[in-house]
Amino acid sequence: LIIGFGISGRHSITVTTVASAGNIGEDGILSCTFEPDIKLSDIVIQWLKEGVLGLVHEFKEGKDELSEQDEMFRGRTAVFADQVIVGNASLRLKNVQLTDAGTYKCYIITSKGKGNANLEYKTGAFSMPEVNVDYNASSETLRCEAPRWFPQPTVVWASQVDQGANFSEVSNTSFELNSENVTMKVVSVLYNVTINNTYSCMIENDIAKATGDIKVTESEIKRRSHLQLLNSKAS
């Protein structure tokens, strides 16, 4: 969480941003909130990205003002116009690109004063893993697959019964480049698995951590997946 204050001339207002991560090819949110004003026409929101000549987005007098918008963001940004009056200056970023990563600044001007805060935005690819029993294999084998990751993650297997065991010798992980030549499909195979045990396939890079669990008993198979974004800090 980053909290910024405005200084010089007029009063300062508190602006708060939260560091976040975007999944390339999907839509993302750059979070920014501020002390609200009673008049929408008095609120100016300006989003900047460090190293970019134009603006990311500008909203003033109740509408978008995009004459100075940088080409790299053209047609890809929007504020939540109906929520600006209550202090939400968050920016929706469509079709997140790898190059959208960087430091952003959310500037706010209201009748009460002005303020700004920075936001670190990471980009990459992350997806839920699915763990299945590989019935084609000669021995009891589990197969963990996740369709889109970038940068290349690490894959670690764990088991409920053999806690702390190192499965690197009995697993094999491969990364297959997807058609867009950026993201990769992750496939990890775990051999010599035992019945009545819960296995976890943990995939992690510097943006996200995902876990796929599978519990195999003689009567049923239970699966569960979980994904967590890393380093979501407010400022």
């Epitope: 900047l48 460090e50 190293g51 970019v52 000549l53 134009g54 100075e68 940088d70 080409e71 190059t99």
Partner: antibody, heavy 117, light 107 residues
């Protein structure tokens, strides 16, 4: 630490060509737009040209449009300015600048270009 | 093109003085104005961006204000290291323009 080092300046005859380079280090070069700004001897600053981080967008001052070309090689962290049809009024110290929040936050020490017969 | 006019062109002052430099734009540039300090034979150094934001590492005696057309750079208490030439610069559009400069010299 951000460092920008210009090179390629020198004496050239009117109508001649020169290529300036700016070697960048200490930051992720491809993420930052870059600019060239010049300063004639004893005079003020004059913006020459800018280029976006990926090199896809370029901008020029009217005084150099059609004669100068800005480019970058992100694999080598290098910014370039190709100057053709040089005139006496192009004589100046040429600075490369890294763009921060829309403006130049770090500048090199400059390279002198003298156009004279 | 947007023109910037700085005043005064030269300013004589003493250490400890409060110094104000004005920059006037030919049309509104919102808050897209920067201030630079340049010493003889050296590259310009960014002091203020977006009219009033202090660049990291710049002493707090420097401050900027204004929006639209009229802008000011203030040095609250002039130090020996502050004798230099100061330039305002607009970046409201993709083409930058600079003021003609203000030389701050020792009285």
């Amino acid at each position: 630490e951000v460092q920008l080092l210009e090179s390629g300046g020198g004496l050239v005859q009117p109508g001649g060509s020169l290529r300036l380079s700016c070697a960048a280090s200490g930051f992720t070069f491809s993420s930052y737009a870059m600019s060239w700004v010049r300063q004639a001897p004893g005079k003020g600053l004059e913006w020459v040209s800018s280029i976006s981080g990926n090199g896809g967008s370029t901008y020029y001052a009217d005084s150099v449009k059609g004669r100068f070309t800005i480019s970058r090689d992100n694999s080598k962290n290098t910014l370039s300015l190709q100057m053709n049809s040089l005139r006496a009024e192009d004589t100046a110290v040429y600075y490369c600048a890294k763009v921060g929040w829309r403006t130049g936050d770090y500048w090199g020490q400059g390279t002198l270009v003298t156009v004279s017969s | 093109d947007i023109q910037l006019t700085q005043s005064p062109s030269t300013l004589s002052a003493s250490v400890g003085d409060r110094v104000t430099i004005t920059c006037r734009a030919s049309q509104s540039i919102s808050s897209w104005l920067a201030w630079y300090q340049q010493k003889a034979g050296k590259a310009p150094k960014l002091l203020i961006y977006k009219a009033s934001d202090l660049e990291s590492g710049v002493p707090s005696r420097f401050s900027g204000s204004g929006s639209g057309i009229e802008f000011t750079l203030t040095i609250s208490s002039l130090q020996p290291d502050d004798f230099a030439t100061y330039y305002c610069q607009q970046y409201n559009s993709y083409s930058w323009t600079f003021g003609q400069g203000t030389k701050v010299e020792i009285k």
